[in-house]
Every structure is written in C-alpha cells, then in structure tokens.
C-alpha cells in the first residue's frame, strides 16, 4: 500500500489557447485531470488502473501552482494504491478549460482540452521527487512526482506491513525494509522475549522483563547459579538442588551429626589432647595435674602418690614434700638404707640384692606394686574409661561403668539406637542424632514398620478361567475361587469331563 504523489508546479499557456488553437474566452480557466496506470510501451487510452484524480481550477492561462491546498484541491495530488508497487507506471496529465463551474467530464465540450501529456517509465519507492517538464507547441507544464509507502508499509514495493509495537506480543519499531528492530532489552522473532540479566543461568534462570533473573525451583542467587540444598541441611552443600553433601566432620541425612566433636567444640580443658571416638563422642587425655572427663579438675600434687616406699605426702604451696619411713631417703623416698637382710619386701615379694648388697629390689606378686610391694595395684589410675565412664577396681581386674549411650570394655563405643534391631518386618534402620528412622519394605508402614499395609495380591490378575481372586491379608497372597470345571491354585487346569455312557 502506498501513494503516488504528483506535484504540479507551473503551467504556461501564454496565448491562452485550446489544443485546437482556438482561444479561450475570456482566458483559459485551467484545471487538470490525472490518470495513473500500469506501464504501457505506448501509452494509450483506457482504464486508469492505478487511479485518477482531478483538481479544481488552479489558474488562468499561465500560473504557478501553490503547494498544499488551492481552491479546495491538494498539491501534491495523491493517488493511493492498495497493492504491491510494480516499479513501473504510465501517467497521463490533461489540462482542461472550464467555461463554467461544472468540471465533470460529461459537462465539458470535447474541444475544451488545452493540452495532454503522457509519460511512462520506472519509478522506485523513495522520498526524492523526480522533476519533469513537458512542452508542446503552445504550452509547457513543470511538475514532479514520487511514490512513497502508506503509513505502516515498508520495503521496495510497499508490500511489508509493519506496525511498531510495545506490548506483550512484541517490543519493536520498523526498519525501512519492514523488518522488526527490537527495542533495547528484547529479542526473538517478534521481539517478545526479554533479554535476562547478563550472566543469568540459561537453564536455571528466566525472566519476564529485561535485565531480570528469576530462579527456577531449586536454584538461588543473583544469577540463579547456586543450588538450594535439602531443607534442613545444616553442615552440607549441594551441586544439584535438594542435595545435602556433608562438610568434613559432619554426617547424617541433614549433615547435622557431629563426627568431629573435638574440632567443632574443643571440649577438653587445660591443654588436654582430644580424640574423636564416634558420633558426638570424644576422649580427653589430660596433662599431668588434671583429671575429669574434660580434664577440667585440677589434681592435688599428692594425688599422684609421688612418695615411694611408704613415704607420706604433704601438700605445700610450691609443690609437695615426702616424709620417708625409716630406712628411706630422697625427694620421693626412693633411696633405701635397707638391704635384703632387713626383709623389706611385703606381701610375699621376693628380695634381690643389687650393687654388691648396697641396695635391693623387690619382685612383687600379682596385684601388688611399689618399691616394697606395699601397694595394692589400682588399675584405675590411668583413667582407662573413655567418654566419662567410671572405673571400678574388682580384685585383680578392673571394669568401666559406662554413661548412657556408650558401651565396650572402655566405654569407647557409641551405642547405636539401631543395635537392638527396632525396625520390624525387615525395615532398614538409620541412626539419627535424636533417635532413629525406619525405612519400611513394601507392605509395611509406621514408625517401626509395625503396621501391615494391605498389598493387593490380586492386582496382577493371577487367576485364570474367570476365577474370582481374593487377597489373604494375613499373608499378602491370593486365593483363586475356581468356577465349575476348573482346578489348580490358579484354576488353570480343566477338570476331565465324565465319560459318556452308551446306554
């Protein structure tokens, strides 16, 4: 769709005569008829296939034509067309004399024609005017013309309809060729797709308007490139959504079970050495002078029984002092003035002379110790019980009384809640920090898989020959009730028909 525009500029008819040579009376009151048609090698009369237009009287004899309106007409003259511009045309411009006010063709005598020009040629769509001048023996016409596209039509032949748009069916303006030019922030064939925030993850992010980055379920972050871990994940991360991959030192479904209590909580006091001994359990090895589960208690220096050979220990502000029994001397009463002749070994210990009789050593029987076998062995002095277990002497042996949740000879083992097999019917037990969880096999449910869920054993239609199937809820098996003439666990065998008798 477009418009052929014709701008009449000047008409010269100095003698004021008609085409016949006869003069106009009193002068030639001139108007124009224009015929636009398809290209003809020789322009001939016939239908004006591209359109016609007439002007009012524009002047007398010779005159210049003003732009825009003139006596109600328009200049340039408009010849609209609703088809693809072919690029070629024929144009006929006739100048007529109007004796009266009626300008209709049938109201004019045929000899009222002043002049007629016909041109044809190629004409491309464009904004530039083509200037032309046609001269006959008596007249001269100067004019210009061009073809432009109608509003919203584009391209070399005005065939491309394009209307600028800025709504959810497109965000664009139109290029001279009719192609769309997307507004900033939009893309796609019809410029209806927003361009998301730069870097927004292609799969995990999207947007409904430009420079936005909305995350799909399971993703987060400004660019939707961070996965969201499992809800409740405490000390873990993810590489895909809803995962919970535990950080070092943590375990369990939600990474909330502490496998490195020592590092995370530093429970051991007074420079003690901490050792992890299981989930949320640990053992503190105390430095000399300290005791307690967490080595939080300071020992009296005499508590370590530093005085030997029956010496008695006295605490002092700057340490301790040993009061030695007769026959002994030294800081810890470690030196003896006795010999084997003095029978220094108690509790059946045997005496062995050393240094040519200047000294001796006692070899103690089991359960006794000390330089003179004077001490009953206390097997608990080395704090052998882990995790706060209490050490008890039992004659020649010792035992550990463990705190709840721990077991083993030295209370070194964490008691698993699953150890007592609490899950019924073959359920799988999972230790959690605050209890346990059972994963039940098909057909069972409940916290301990104790509830039997009915399995429809008949769902697979196991019975043949139109037998009726019943589910035995106690065993989750099926029973087939056979119709007459069939037997078998699935009613699969026909019963032999009774023989026919001849009588």
């Amino acid at each position: 769709s477009g418009v052929f525009q014709l701008q009449l500029q000047e008409f010269i008819n100095e003698r004021g005569v008609l085409a016949s040579g006869r003069p106009c009376e009193p002068g030639c009151r001139t108007f124009f008829r224009v015929c636009l048609k398809h290209f003809q090698a020789v322009v001939s009369p016939g239908p004006c296939t591209f359109g016609t237009v007439s002007t009012p009287v524009l002047g007398t004899n010779s005159f210049a034509v003003r732009d825009d309106s003139s006596g109600g007409g328009r200049n340039p003259l408009q010849l609209p067309f609703n088809f693809t511009w072919p690029g070629t045309f024929s144009l006929i411009i006739e100048a007529w004399h109007a004796p009266g006010d009626d300008l209709r063709p049938e109201a004019l005598p045929p000899d009222a024609l002043i002049s007629k020009i016909a041109i044809q040629g190629s004409l491309a769509v464009g904004q530039n005017w083509l200037l032309d001048e046609q001269t006959s023996t008596l007249t001269r016409l100067r004019y210009s013309y061009r073809v432009i596209c109608s509003d919203n039509y584009y391209g070399d032949n005005c065939s491309r309809l394009c209307k600028k748009r800025n709504d959810h069916f497109g965000h664009y303006v139109c290029q001279p060729d009719g192609n769309l030019s997307c507004l900033p922030g939009w893309t796609g064939e019809y410029c209806q797709q927003p361009i998301c925030l730069s870097g927004c993850h292609e799969q995990n992010g999207y947007c409904s308007k430009p420079a936005e980055c909305l995350c799909r379920p399971g993703w987060q972050g400004r660019l939707c490139n961070e996965c969201i871990p499992h809800n409740g994940c405490r000390h873990g991360t993810c590489s895909t959504p809803w995962q919970c991959t535990c950080d070092e030192g943590w375990g369990g479904l939600f990474c909330d079970q502490d496998l490195n209590y020592c590092t995370h909580h530093s429970p051991c006091k007074n420079g003690a050495t901490c050792s992890n001994s299981g989930q949320r359990s640990y053992t503190c090895t105390c430095r000399p002078g300290y005791t307690g589960v967490d080595c939080e208690l300071e020992l009296s220096e005499c508590d370590s029984n530093p005085c030997r050979n029956g010496g008695s220990c006295k605490d002092q502000e700057d340490g301790y002092h040993c009061l030695c029994p007769p026959g002994y001397y030294g800081l810890h009463c470690e030196h003896s003035t006795l010999s084997c002749a003095d029978s220094p070994c108690f509790n059946g210990g045997s005496c062995r002379e050393r240094n040519q009789g200047a000294n001796y050593a006692c070899e103690c029987p089991p359960n006794f110790t000390g330089s003179n076998c004077e001490k009953k062995v206390d097997r608990c002095t080395s704090n052998p019980c882990a995790n706060g277990g209490q050490c008890l002497n039992r004659g020649p042996s010792r035992m550990c009384r463990c705190r709840p949740g721990f077991t083993g000879t030295y209370c070194e083992l964490h008691v698993s809640d699953c150890a007592r097999n609490p899950c019924a019917h073959g359920g799988t037990c999972h230790d959690l920090e605050n209890g346990l969880m059972c994963t039940c096999p098909a057909g069972f449910s409940g916290r301990r898989c104790e509830v039997r869920t009915s399995i429809d054993a008949c769902a697979s239609s196991p019975c043949f020959n139109r037998a009726t199937c019943y589910t035995d809820l106690s065993t989750d098996t099926f029973v087939c009730n056979c119709p007459y003439g069939f037997v078998g666990s699935r009613c699969e065998f026909p019963v032999g028909l009774p023989p026919s008798f001849p009588w």
Partner: antibody, heavy 121, light 106 residues
Framework: EVQLQESGPGLVKPSETLSLTCTVS??????????WGWIRQPPGKGLEWIGD???????YYNPSLKSRVTISVDTSKNQFSLKLSSVTAADTAVYYC??????FGGGADSWGQGTLVTVSS | SYELTQPPSVSVSPGQTASITCSGD??????VSWYQQKPGQSPVLVIY???QRPSGIPERFSGSNSGDTATLTISGTQAMDEADYYC?????????FGSGTKVTVL
C-alpha cells in the same frame, strides 16, 4: 491440532470466587509463541477480554477486572486457570479459554467450546 | 479506556459484498483481528494483522485498516456467512473487542 477444554462449576454464589481451568491438549503450553487467554460473553451480549498469561507466568489483565482476577499456569499439567473473586450476577457468562498467537499479532487462533457460569444464590 | 465501534447489523444479498466497519482512535496504527461467531458456537479467527487469512478461511474474507477505521469485507456472500462478527485490537497490554455486528444474508 491443539485443543482447549474449559472445566469448573457451572453455578457460583454471589460474593464467592469463580474458578475455571483450561486444559490444553495436542500441543505444549510451554511455548514462547503463545499467550493463553480468558474471554467471556454474557448471554446475548458481546465478547469481553479478561486477561492472559504465558508459560513463565507473566500475566496481563483487563483494567476493569484487574482487582478481582487471577490467572495462573501449571506447565506440568498443561493447564491454565482463572479465578474471579467477589462475583455478582453481572459475571454470569459463557467463559472461553483461547490461545493467542504471537505470530498472528495476538489473534486468538484456537478457542475452547466455552462453559456457562451462572452467578446465583 | 480504548473503544472499538461496530454497526449493530449489516444485511446483504447472497452473492453480494458485505462490508463491516470497526472504528477506533488511530486504529490504523494497531493490528486488527476479526472473529466470526455463529449461534451456540465459539468464535473463529477469520482475519489477523488487518488483512491476513488463517489457513482454512475462504478467500472471500478480506480485511483492510487505515486511519481510524478497519473493514472486514465478505465478497460473494454465502448463506453460511450469516453470523456475528467481532473486531479486536490490543491497547496498552489489554485486548479490546468491538461491540459486534450481526450479518444477515437476505
């Protein structure tokens, strides 16, 4: 060929919420080439556009109904839905769901058969 | 709000041309769609983007749009063309329908 089917109650009480669902078959709702719209037609009257939505949930509503309308999409079920709150007798109409094609300049090239919703106590 | 105005009715003899107009402010700058609706049926798109026909729509349906007026033309009208016709355009992200024109084939 894509087909649309409206479903929902045919009778709603005044002041309650009208809820309809449109199920799309023969094509995916998750296409950037279409919007999915609701249009209604009161008995003996003309068509009125209610609103539309695309697969990522961008919605556009008729300004005169905007305060009462919610349109949502469920791509997993290939469905989109209409909720119209605080209904009155004036909301009695045949409600159509339709597919609006971006390549048709927004023209609705496929329609459901429509469902009559009557607002009455 | 934007309004589209259509004549309530148009009558045409079989084989003749029916023209239905749709008027709105600067409508020529918007794309117009036309829908045909027969009694008891859903609307059918017959013209989109002013003058384009969807597949399956007969060539006798044509459209134009300029200035403030869009026109749907049915040339060689048939009895089966008797229906209500609605124009539709988009304004400020909202769909707008015309009031509808009843075409009667005499």
């Amino acid at each position: 060929e894509v087909q649309l089917q409206e479903s929902g109650p045919g009778l709603v009480k005044p002041s309650e919420t009208l809820s309809l669902t449109c199920t799309v078959s023969g094509g995916s709702i998750s296409s950037g080439s279409y919007y999915w719209g609701w249009i209604r037609q009161p008995p003996g009257k003309g068509l009125e556009w209610i609103g539309d939505i695309n697969y990522i949930g961008s919605t556009y509503y008729n300004p005169s109904l905007k305060s009462r309308v919610t349109i949502s999409v469920d791509t997993s079920k290939n469905q989109f839905s209409l909720k119209l709150s605080s209904v009155t007798a004036a909301d009695t109409a045949v409600y159509y769901c339709a597919r609006e094609a971006v390549s048709f300049g927004g023209g609705a090239d496929s329609w459901g058969q429509g469902t009559l919703v009557t607002v009455s106590s | 709000s934007y309004e589209l105005t259509q004549p309530p009715s148009v009558s045409v003899s079989p084989g003749q041309t029916a023209s239905i107009t749709c008027s709105g402010d600067r409508l020529g700058d918007k794309y117009v769609s036309w829908y045909q609706q027969k009694p008891g049926q859903s609307p059918v798109l017959v013209i989109y983007e002013d003058s384009q026909r969807p597949s399956g729509i007969p060539e006798r349906f044509s459209g134009s749009n300029s200035g403030d007026t869009a026109t749907l033309t049915i040339s060689g009208t048939q009895a089966m063309d008797e229906a209500d016709y609605y124009c539709q355009a988009w304004d400020m992200e909202a769909g707008v329908f015309g009031s509808g024109t009843k075409v009667t084939v005499l």
